[in-house]
């Protein structure tokens, strides 16, 4: 069947999700598309516990997550509600800074070296994290 009951090779299972951590960089949209071709999405952080898990695996390196405001409001790529959800921005962020000289503001969110979030130019080639959820059907405990 099409159900994903265990994580693919080279992915890490945590709390019923599978995570894959890149060691090279891409622009945000290319990283997002890469994850989608893996039947996944850029990581969506929904709790402090998940934040710490991801932070542990990526280390002090700028890393894309599945959060952007390219169409106006901030949105998670899987539809998770931004306004009521977990947030971990650095102080004064997001600031949609235009001073970088690359044109436009900053529309894509990434983990910074201390794990807190910043908005940045989406074309920057940062590392990224893919996430896919294990199927609900596979979460039932086996019958004894």
């Amino acid at each position: 069947g099409s159900e994903r009951t265990c994580c693919p090779v080279n992915w890490v299972e945590h709390e019923r999700s599978c995570y894959w951590f890149s060691r090279s960089g891409k622009a945000w949209a290319d990283a997002d598309n890469y994850c989608r071709l893996e039947d996944a999405h850029l990581v969506v952080v929904t709790s402090w516990e998940e934040q710490k898990f991801v932070q542990h695996h990526i280390g002090p390196v700028n890393t894309w997550m599945g959060l952007h405001d390219q169409n106006g409001p901030w949105k998670w790529v899987d539809g998770t509600d931004y306004e009521t959800g977990f947030k971990n921005w650095r102080p004064e962020q997001p600031d949609d800074w235009y001073g970088h000289g690359l044109g436009g503001g900053e529309d894509c969110a990434h983990f910074t070296d201390d794990g807190r979030w910043n908005d940045d130019v989406c074309q920057r080639p940062y590392r990224w994290v893919c996430e896919t959820e294990l199927d609900k059907a596979s979460q039932e405990p086996p019958l004894l």
């Epitope: 099409s2 994903r4 693919p8 890149s22 060691r23 090279s24 960089g25 891409k26 622009a27 290319d30 990283a31 598309n33 890469y34 989608r36 071709l37 893996e38 039947d39 080639p125």
Partner: antibody, heavy 121, light 108 residues
Amino acid sequence: EAQLLESGGGLEQPGGSLRLSCAASGFTFSSYAMSWVRQAPGKGLEWVSVISGRGGNTYSADSVKGRFTISRDNSKNTLYLQMNSLRAEDTAVYYCASRLAVAGSEAFHIWGQGTMVTVSS
Amino acid sequence: DIQMTQSPSSLSASIGDRVSITCRASRTINNYLNWYQQKPGKAPKLLIFATSSLQSGVPSRFSGSGSGTDFTLTISSLQPEDFATYYCQQTYSTPLFAFGPGTKVDIK
């Protein structure tokens, strides 16, 4: 041995339709994103379309967007390309290929032998 | 979109020659660069992925190098079976996997 075998090519008039198939064997088909790549006579390679392993995500080149649709049936280990509104410039050998993803890099590591599509009146 | 160019478009060489083909991207693609070999009437074959990683079963006389925008495929000692057309491909811009125009290697 991993193999891909295309079929469904042939001669079609401009504006017509064709459906290409690609039968996979020797590897876990559903674990790989699959792609179509074409090559016009005497020309280079052009990426056409790609679909994720479970079929939930698809992308196509601008040159075929809205006309060609990629799909797959993992229960049959088969990849498809539905080609509508065919044009003379679609004349090419069409290859299916599997996408290898290693440490963030991607490549097409298994290729079929190709099927020829000719669009002419 | 990222455009790929190759040079030369064709070259003539002798058995045992060291041959180099260059590929250039219109903007930086880090190490997201593959090389393929294609013989007439046959499907392409993956030789090298991620700039320098040799695909399983490919002879060690093939090697790849480069980074950023400029890349090179080198055949250290050309063999009769190496006469073919070689294509580079960028995969930085997922999924717009653009190929170069090809370099044809034939017998001098």
